[in-house]
């Protein structure tokens, strides 16, 4: 696959994966619980990490967010932290990959630059995909948790049923959010690792020898102290760089124009 | 820590009116299923009466025609106002409310300490 391939696609993936963890943290189906054996009424109760939603079997949907931080479980705010974290990474993956990108010129920018910019992003976007994925999987092992812990009920009062908390058994579920959240950080993570891929076949490349091809000038030609290590590509300025004023060209020079010079 | 408690309780004759009151207060969310709950004198606690939040009703067939459930989602507030009263309708009448706690991330379920309801004859 070509550079410009990779690259460009890696950054399309983290761009759906981004989108997916957006759109997780924004979605109010973390957890579901179904009340089934409510006394009334068919009872659908699901949870986001901003707002708490009720659903009657007639038809009757409420919603309310959580309007203080006070009370909120911890971990429901380790979760909103990384999924934020996350996104704000993805944005700033997202913008240096555009800047980045091989298929875009910006100015006089040159491939050193973009694949010192292509590495950034890539490593932005497995970040942002690693904390998508620990939020959703930290917030599924509260869930856990919680079934677990919901078996215990709470009393208070003297005996009979006067006066008496107690916790109510429902069936807890994983909510959609959660798998679009895994999906969504696994993608980024991995348009994330082909950006970083792609990134080594942006620089230049430091430990083959590149060929040099001379012309016959009609004059000798004495060797220059270091063009040698001019015409290998060490360090960025001496790329596709003139090394004799009689005729050696980099590998560089001679694909870019091929018919400008004889061989020998 | 969500305390329901219920009012209105007290002696009455037969075939008259009583409003029964069952306010929730406390660190409330969300209260979803209110209910009244009746258990007359070594007999088994029965459902008299239910609502949900989006108004959907439920009674015990000995009630349907004589009873009326009702709430205030706002005030958090349940009533059951209770018309042509009968003897057999003598019982402890218990509030109950199920509410989601955001805190543990669990329904709670809350009853009252009751209020008692005679109907003589």
């Known amino acids: 696959m070509s550079v410009t391939a990779c690259q460009g696609l890696g950054f399309v993936v983290s761009l759906i994966g981004f989108a997916g963890i957006i759109a997780a943290t924004c979605m109010d189906q973390w957890s579901t619980q179904d009340l089934y054996n409510n006394p009334v009424t068919a009872v659908f109760n699901y949870q986001g990490l901003w707002r708490s939603c009720v659903r009657e079997s007639s038809g009757f949907t409420e919603c309310r967010g959580y309007f203080t931080l006070l009370g909120l479980p911890a971990m429901l705010q380790a979760v909103r932290a990384l999924m934020i974290v996350g996104i704000v990474l993805g944005v700033i993956g997202i913008l240096v990959s555009i800047f980045a990108l091989k298929c875009i010129r910006i100015g006089s920018m040159d491939d050193s630059a973009k694949a010192k910019m292509t590495l950034t992003s890539g490593i932005l976007f497995i970040i942002s995909g690693i904390c998508a994925i620990i939020g959703v999987s930290v917030f599924a092992n509260m869930l856990v948790t919680n079934f677990w812990m919901s078996t215990a009920n709470m009393y208070s009062g003297m005996g009979g049923m006067g006066g008496m908390v107690q916790t109510v058994q429902t069936r807890y579920t994983f909510g959609a959010a959660l798998f679009v959240g895994w999906v969504a950080g696994g993608l980024t993570l991995i348009g994330g690792v082909m950006m970083c891929i792609a990134c080594r076949g942006l620089t230049p490349d430091d430990s083959n020898f590149k060929a040099v091809s001379y012309h016959a000038s009609g004059q000798n030609v004495a060797y220059r102290p270091g063009g040698f290590k001019a015409s290998t590509g060490f360090g960025s300025n001496t790329r596709n760089k003139k090394i004799y004023d009689g005729g050696a060209r980099t590998e560089d020079d001679e694909q870019s124009h091929p018919t400008k010079y004889d061989y020998v | 820590e969500v305390q329901v408690q219920e009012s209105g309780g007290g002696l009455v004759q037969a075939g008259t009116s009583l409003r029964l009151s069952c306010a929730a207060s406390?660190?409330?969310?969300?209260?979803?299923?209110m209910g009244w709950y009746r258990q007359a004198p070594g007999k088994q606690r029965e459902l008299v009466a239910g609502i949900s939040r989006g108004g959907t009703t439920t009674y015990a067939h000995s009630v349907k025609e004589r009873f009326t459930i009702s709430r205030d989602n706002a005030k958090n507030t349940m009533y059951l106002q209770m018309n042509s009263l009968k003897s057999e309708d003598t019982a402890g009448y218990y509030c109950?409310?199920?509410?989601?706690?955001?805190?543990?991330?669990?329904?709670?379920?809350?009853w009252g300490q009751g209020t008692l309801v005679t109907v003589s004859a």
């Open positions: 109950n409310a199920q509410a989601w706690d955001p805190g543990t991330f669990r329904y709670l379920e809350v």
């Open positions: 406390g660190n409330i969310f969300r209260i979803d299923t």
